[in-house]
Amino acid sequence: PGPPPGPPRVSPDPRAELDSTVLLTRSLLADTRQLAAQLRDKFPADGDHNLDSLPTLAMSAGALGALQLPGVLTRLRADLLSYLRHVQWLRRAGGSSLKTLEPELGTLQARLDRLLRRLQLLMSRLALPQPPPDPPAPPLAPPSSAWGGIRAAHAILGGLHLTLDWAVRGLLLLKTRL
């Protein structure tokens, strides 16, 4: 009468799912910290660096009390997609100076991509509403000079580090509320 039915599909434990996402986020945080330090060693930053195309900060001490899982994951995914785009742009248009950050910058890009896939999977497993497909983002203009590329790298890695730092704290907090 055909093969016996397989074992019943166990629905994933949301805390375990979130745990593995936290681990990936922490790991990427450590990678970003290391790469930012490497960049500072090679090209010391003079003051603060900003890039208008980067996402604005989404979390702070005041926002933690009102955190909701769907909102956090949706926003985090959107911000990380933006950072992925900026890292790709940096590798393509950042100039020869930034080639000295390879292969680490490539590794960072691959791990960021992996975390994004993990977030997407987590959202579908938790049956959270899927965000609409991202509208095509306007292309990023190439840096005006070699120093412009280095300043952009400081801003991108600094912003990504801060975003991941808050993401770890927010995800840890949400885990306790599940």
């Epitope: 922490r26 945080l29 930053a45 003051g47 603060d48 660096h49 900003n50 900060l57 702070s60 001490a61 005041g62 926002a63 600094g158 912003g159 580090h161 801060l162 730092d165 808050w166 770890v168 704290r169 840890l172 907090l173 306790t176």
Partner: antibody
Framework: EVQLLESGGGLVQPGGSLRLSCAAS????????MNWLRQAPGKGLEWVAV????????FYADFVKGRFTISRDNSKNTLYLQMNSLRAEDTAVYYC??????????WGQGTLVTVSS | QSVLTQPPSASGTPGQRVTISCSGS????????VNWYQQLPGTAPKLLIY???LLPSGVPDRFSGSKSGTSASLAISGLRSEDEADYYC???????????FGGGTKLTVL
């Protein structure tokens, strides 16, 4: 290089007031939550207050609620702590510190506040 | 009385491995990240470990952190004389809605 420089400490009488300042440089001040912490002579560390990066949210330790007010001016890259109704037990070195997530990654050198008659 | 509990003192000889413990409850260490700070004599505290076991830039990998349940620990291997300092553990506390510290551990290198 990230730098935090506190000022405004000194000797004040019990019941008096003092305003501490913390000048920040070397990073985008408006992106970071900022804190005040303190350390009484020969004692451990105590967290005092935190303010969100845009100044919209503030949290205080129970022992300073209603007496201390944390504020910031992002246009001046400066953090403040207004201390009223000071008590002898508020005597401490006061530190400002930056928070990127759950931790204090950079600290100032501290300013000493002495409350005594 | 500190919310987190640390031994007041610890000691070791150069080259040795020393561990400092920090115990709390589910509202702080159990549910939140643990951070460790080093305070050398006469100086401001410095971040040593964050998110339980991550090292900031510039901190040697002789330092390591771990966490299990409502307890955390800091390990220092290959002890050096310059490690003589006060060490503090810290975590956010959900019930107090603020950051809490341990009382600090004074490490002496014999």
């Amino acid at each position: 290089e990230v730098q935090l420089l506190e000022s405004g400490g000194g000797l004040v009488q019990p019941g008096g007031s003092l305003r501490l300042s913390c000048a920040a440089s070397g990073f985008t001040f408006s992106h970071y939550d900022m804190n005040w912490l303190r350390q009484a002579p020969g004692k451990g560390l105590e967290w005092v207050a935190v303010i969100s990066y845009d100044g919209s949210n503030k949290f205080y330790a129970d022992f300073v609620k209603g007496r201390f007010t944390i504020s910031r001016d992002n246009s001046k890259n400066t953090l403040y702590l207004q201390m009223n109704s000071l008590r002898a037990e508020d005597t401490a070195v006061y530190y400002c510190a930056r928070t990127p997530g759950s931790h204090f990654d950079y600290w100032g050198q501290g300013t000493l506040v002495t409350v005594s008659s | 009385q500190s919310v987190l509990t640390q031994p007041p003192s610890a000691s070791g000889t150069p080259g040795q491995r020393v561990t400092i413990s920090c115990s709390g409850s589910s509202s702080n260490i159990g549910n939140n990240a643990v951070n460790w700070y080093q305070q050398l004599p006469g100086t401001a505290p410095k971040l040593l470990i964050y998110y339980d076991d991550l090292l900031p830039s510039g901190v040697p990998d002789r330092f390591s952190g771990s966490k299990s349940g409502t307890s955390a620990s800091l390990a220092i291997s290959g002890l050096r004389s310059e490690d003589e300092a006060d060490y503090y553990c810290s975590a956010w506390d959900d019930s107090l809605n603020g950051v809490v510290f341990g009382g600090g551990t004074k490490l002496t290198v014999l």
